[in-house]
């Protein structure tokens, strides 16, 4: 008996071939001997089966001695043995229809679980293997689960169902809803304008939800909500914003926030959360602000940074084109009685400059000038 695997919702062609290469009488029946379809001369005739409106054949193939049964919009319950009667012979074809679906939705938040469920006909014992877009293989029976979805899991999952040495392939498009970056850090000199960007790692036609940026300033004892906003069909509208600082927000995606001035009291860490309509859970992106200030007070030249810096970052003070006068893994450095000239305060990571502030030290009879 020939075995054919089909996919739920798909169309399948069950073949039946006669030795004579011409149009002759044929019939297709199911295992209960109920006629599905056949021919009367050149006309297609249909029987009283449940397949009536979904069964068809191909007239142009009859003249070649081929009498296919074509079943559209396959259902699991179409799984059966189909019998083709032609030339006093009977050809049996066993059709097994499988379905593979993702739990609830194919748009899932980062960190959530994906469950794939296999629908199969009674009496079948299929095995399933799925390959994620990043090449990770998972195997299972009726259900397959992947916990803690990552951004790289977005894309087409290819699942192969094996039964009776035959296979059928399913492709499921999964979208992991997340920000492009889990965390970002912005380095700014005091007084500079700060731009925070929160690009999404996915595109959907309609995006609706609400969000908030909570800020924990290094100098503050508790965190504070800086801004709340709504998102409707990719349009951003601000609901509430603090007076200090007075953030501005872009009206279009990607989510974009502007802080008019980088000040030491704003240095710290923020957490932008985005709750999407019809989704449980929230998207998160951490953002950090490091602020640098270089000052000269009487005979003391000081450079300070505020905000979340790694212990391996180096803070240096150096006179332009000269070796660093002072270089420490600390958040403040200073030079007493600095020589006149252009001084540079540098925050660097393994030799790469992250932030730089220049201050001009004038001869002792003058006051300092900050460019």
């Amino acid at each position: 008996k020939k075995v054919v695997l089909g996919k739920k919702g798909d169309t399948v062609e069950l073949t039946c071939t006669a030795s004579q290469k011409k149009s002759i009488q044929f019939h297709w029946k199911n295992s209960n001997q109920i006629k599905i379809l056949g021919n009367q001369g050149s006309f297609l005739t249909k029987g009283p089966s449940k397949l009536n409106d979904r069964a068809d054949s191909r007239r142009s193939l009859w003249d070649q001695g081929n009498f296919p049964l074509i079943i559209k919009n396959l259902k699991i319950e179409d799984s059966d043995t189909y019998i083709c009667e032609v030339e006093d012979q009977k050809e049996e074809v066993q059709l097994l229809v499988f379905g593979l679906t993702a739990n609830s939705d194919t748009h899932l938040l980062q960190g959530q679980s994906l469950t794939l469920t296999l629908e199969s006909p009674p009496g079948s014992s299929p095995s399933v293997q799925c390959r994620s877009p990043r090449g990770k293989n998972i195997q299972g029976g009726k259900t397959l689960s992947v916990s803690q979805l990552e951004l790289q899991d977005s894309g087409t999952w290819t699942c192969t169902v094996l039964q009776n040495q035959k296979k059928v392939e399913f492709k499921i498009d999964i979208v992991v809803l997340a920000f492009q970056k889990a965390s970002s850090i912005v380095y700014k000199k005091e007084g500079e304008q700060v731009e925070f960007s929160f690009p999404l790692a996915f595109t959907v036609e309609k995006l609706t939800g609400s969000g908030e940026l909570w800020w924990q300033a290094e100098r503050a004892s508790s965190s504070k909500s800086w801004i709340t906003f709504d998102l409707k069909n990719k349009e951003v509208s601000v609901k509430r914003v603090t007076q200090d600082p007075k953030l501005q927000m872009g009206k279009k995606l990607p989510l974009h926030l502007t802080l008019p001035q980088a000040l030491p009291q704003y240095a710290g860490s923020g957490n932008l959360t985005l709750a999407l309509e019809a989704k449980t859970g929230k998207l998160h992106q951490e953002v950090n602000l490091v602020v640098m200030r270089a000052t000269q007070l009487q005979k003391n030249l000081t450079c300070e940074v505020w905000g979340p810096t790694s212990p391996k970052l180096m803070l240096s003070l150096k006179l332009e084109n000269k070796e660093a006068k002072v270089s420490k893994r600390e958040k403040a450095v200073w030079v007493l009685n600095p020589e006149a000239g252009m001084w540079q305060c540098l925050l660097s990571d393994s030799g790469q400059v992250l932030l730089e502030s220049n201050i001009k030290v004038l001869p002792t009879w003058s006051t300092p000038v900050q460019p």
Partner: antibody, heavy 115, light 107 residues
Framework: QVQLQQWGAGLLKPSETLSLTCAVS????????WSWIRQPPGKGLEWIGE???????NCNPSLKSRVTISVDTSKNQFSLKLSSVTAADTAMYYC?????????WGQGTLVTVSS | DIQMTQTPSSVSASVGDRVTITCRAS??????LAWYQQKPGKAPELLIY???SLQSGVPSRFSGSGSGTDFTLTISSLQPEDFATYFC?????????FGGGTKVESK
């Protein structure tokens, strides 16, 4: 919704080979036959040939010696090659889905053969 | 090959008119016939299949009839969007063949 998107070279010189590809999305690929049809400017429709997912083909005898139809099931795509083209092969070429009748069509590709 | 002869090759009509197009198959094709509508610069669209079955989404003013050799497409009340070219096609045997087309023009 089933969609057929086709592409290929639009300008050929006589004796060259016409090459077109059609990508199918949004529906079943396996249970149907996938056809190529052409229509010379201001004229009627001519069926070129067809293929199914397993590579079984049927061609118009008038073109059979010059036609190659192939299928790539991994991409849900099928292709047409027509060799030794002449000015008489200038036409709008369509891909279409067929069981007995053509229910979904590609947007068409105008192929001009000119020296 | 099965020859499909469509008549007339063109017809002038007004909005609201009843329009009839015929297609003759030689030899006969039982009911293995379809009708298509084609507008300039567009691909044909299936209107009627199996001689008389209306394709999903096609307005009910279109109807088909006939069996064997003679087939008819009727537009009961012509609408402005119906001015187009109409083709018949047989699916009885290879090669699949089309009629020469009937252009429905505005009077």
């Amino acid at each position: 919704q089933v969609q057929l998107q086709q592409w290929g070279a639009g300008l050929l010189k006589p004796s060259e080979t016409l090459s077109l590809t059609c990508a199918v999305s949004g529906g079943s690929f396996s249970g149907y036959y996938w056809s190529w049809i052409r229509q010379p400017p201001g004229k009627g429709l001519e069926w070129i040939g067809e293929i199914n997912h397993s590579g079984s083909t049927n061609c118009n005898p008038s073109l059979k010696s010059r036609v190659t139809i192939s299928v790539d099931t991994s991409k849900n795509q099928f292709s047409l090659k027509l060799s030794s083209v002449t000015a008489a092969d200038t036409a709008m070429y369509y891909c279409a889905r067929v069981l007995n009748f053509f229910d979904y069509w590609g947007q068409g590709t105008l192929v001009t053969v000119s020296s | 090959d099965i020859q499909m002869t469509q008549t007339p090759s063109s017809v002038s009509a007004s909005v609201g008119d009843r329009v009839t197009i015929t297609c003759r198959a030689s030899p006969g094709i039982s009911n293995w016939l379809a009708w298509y509508q084609q507008k300039p610069g567009k691909a044909p669209e299936l209107l009627i299949y199996a001689a008389s079955s209306l394709q999903s989404g096609v307005p009910s003013r279109f109807s088909g009839s006939g069996s064997g050799t003679d087939f008819t497409l009727t537009i009961s009340s012509l609408q402005p969007e119906d001015f187009a070219t109409y083709f018949c096609q047989q699916a009885n045997s290879f090669p699949l063949t089309f009629g020469g087309g009937t252009k429905v023009e505005s009077k």
